[in-house]
């Protein structure tokens, strides 16, 4: 984790339910004015939605993101529908970015 890290992490205040990376990212961006959102396990707990803010503009209570915290592992398969009742994504020929294969680990840091 290099010096000058600028992403601060804060548990989402608005996300509930089983964590889904696409929904978490959307919730953090749209509702919490974050840069991004991602699902992670912290300690031995369940996977939760964390929002990532620019540390220089972060809300109270945000802490520097731990090494390799974001972005999330990519979810395999087809994407889930939007979290806020918008139209679901088009079929696979139209913008779904599922990965070919399973879930790689989060990007490593050195």
């Amino acid at each position: 984790h290099m010096a000058g890290s600028k992403l601060c992490e804060k548990t989402s205040k608005t996300y509930s339910g089983k964590c889904d990376n696409k929904k978490c990212d959307k919730k953090c961006i749209e509702w919490e004015k974050a840069q991004h959102g991602a699902c992670h396990k912290r300690e031995a707990g369940k996977e939760s939605c964390f929002c990532y803010f620019d540390c220089s503009k972060s809300p109270p209570g945000a802490t520097p993101a731990p090494p390799g915290a974001a972005p999330p592992p990519a979810a395999g398969g087809s994407p889930s529908p939007p979290a806020d009742g918008g139209s679901p994504p088009p079929p696979a020929d139209g913008g779904s970015p599922p990965v070919d294969g399973g879930s790689p680990p989060p990007p490593s840091t050195h």
Partner: antibody, heavy 117, light 107 residues
Framework: QVQLKESGPGLVAPSQSLSITCTVS????????VHWVRQPPGKGLEWLGV???????NYNSALMSRLSISKDNSKSQVFLKMNSLQTDDTAIYYC???????????WGQGTTLTVSS | DIQMTQSPSSLSASLGERVSLTCRAS??????LSWLQQKPDGTITRLIY???TLYSGVPKRFSGSRSGSDYSLTISSLESEDFADYYC?????????FGGGTKLEIK
């Protein structure tokens, strides 16, 4: 099938204003963010700004004073407005969709803007 | 702003060759990096997001990796349609910023 298509005036005189439209199909603007990026002739890409699904905007601070992004969800259109144009605003202007949980996954073909008297 | 230093700026290679392009971030971007391909006609297509995740439909000869603040795009065996310009994009912090680009030419 996801598509984005930019349309603009082509030629604008210096100090004038610009309006470029991005018309999308295959997805709804209430579900996705749309970003604007430009590319001056022979140069690299520059991020201009974004309008998110809920209507919130973020801009490149270097251009924020003369840039405005808006949209009409019902018409599936996103608008880029820029004022006080100078010759170095000459570029290809692209719109692109942000797929939540990933990044910019679909791009328009771009529209060329020339700022010249 | 975060500076993305992309290298090399141009590269000549032969069909079937393995090539790697690199982007270095001036600040921590926590893996929020994507790679894009731009064809001579200006068409831009997605390749990779989150540093190493391939978008669906992208050939498996493309791969992305990260080592600290260095991010790499590797094409394992060049095909004729791969000769194009390539850009990295950091989308961790506003303003999002692109690398200067790499022009990949046929030798």
């Amino acid at each position: 099938q996801v598509q984005l298509k930019e349309s603009g005036p082509g030629l604008v005189a210096p100090s004038q204003s610009l309006s470029i439209t991005c018309t999308v199909s295959g997805f709804s603007l209430i579900s996705y963010g749309v970003h604007w990026v430009r590319q001056p002739p022979g140069k690299g890409l520059e991020w201009l700004g974004v309008i998110w699904a809920g209507g919130r905007t973020n801009y490149n601070s270097a251009l924020m004073s003369r840039l405005s992004i808006s949209k009409d969800n019902s018409k599936s259109q996103v608008f880029l407005k820029m004022n006080s144009l100078q010759t170095d605003d000459t570029a290809i202007y692209y719109c692109a969709r942000y797929y939540y949980g990933s990044s910019l996954d679909y791009w328009g073909q771009g529209t060329t803007l020339t700022v010249s008297s | 702003d975060i500076q993305m230093t992309q290298s090399p700026s141009s590269l000549s290679a032969s069909l079937g060759e393995r090539v790697s392009l690199t982007c270095r971030a001036s600040q921590e971007i926590s893996g929020y990096l994507s790679w894009l391909q731009q064809k001579p006609d200006g068409t831009i297509t997605r390749l990779i997001y989150a540093a190493s995740t391939l978008y669906s439909g992208v050939p498996k000869r493309f791969s992305g990796s990260r080592s600290g603040s260095d991010y790499s795009l590797t094409i394992s065996s060049l095909e004729s349609e791969d000769f194009a310009d390539y850009y990295c994009l950091q989308y961790a912090i506003y303003p999002w910023t692109f690398g200067g680009g790499t022009k990949l030419e046929i030798k």
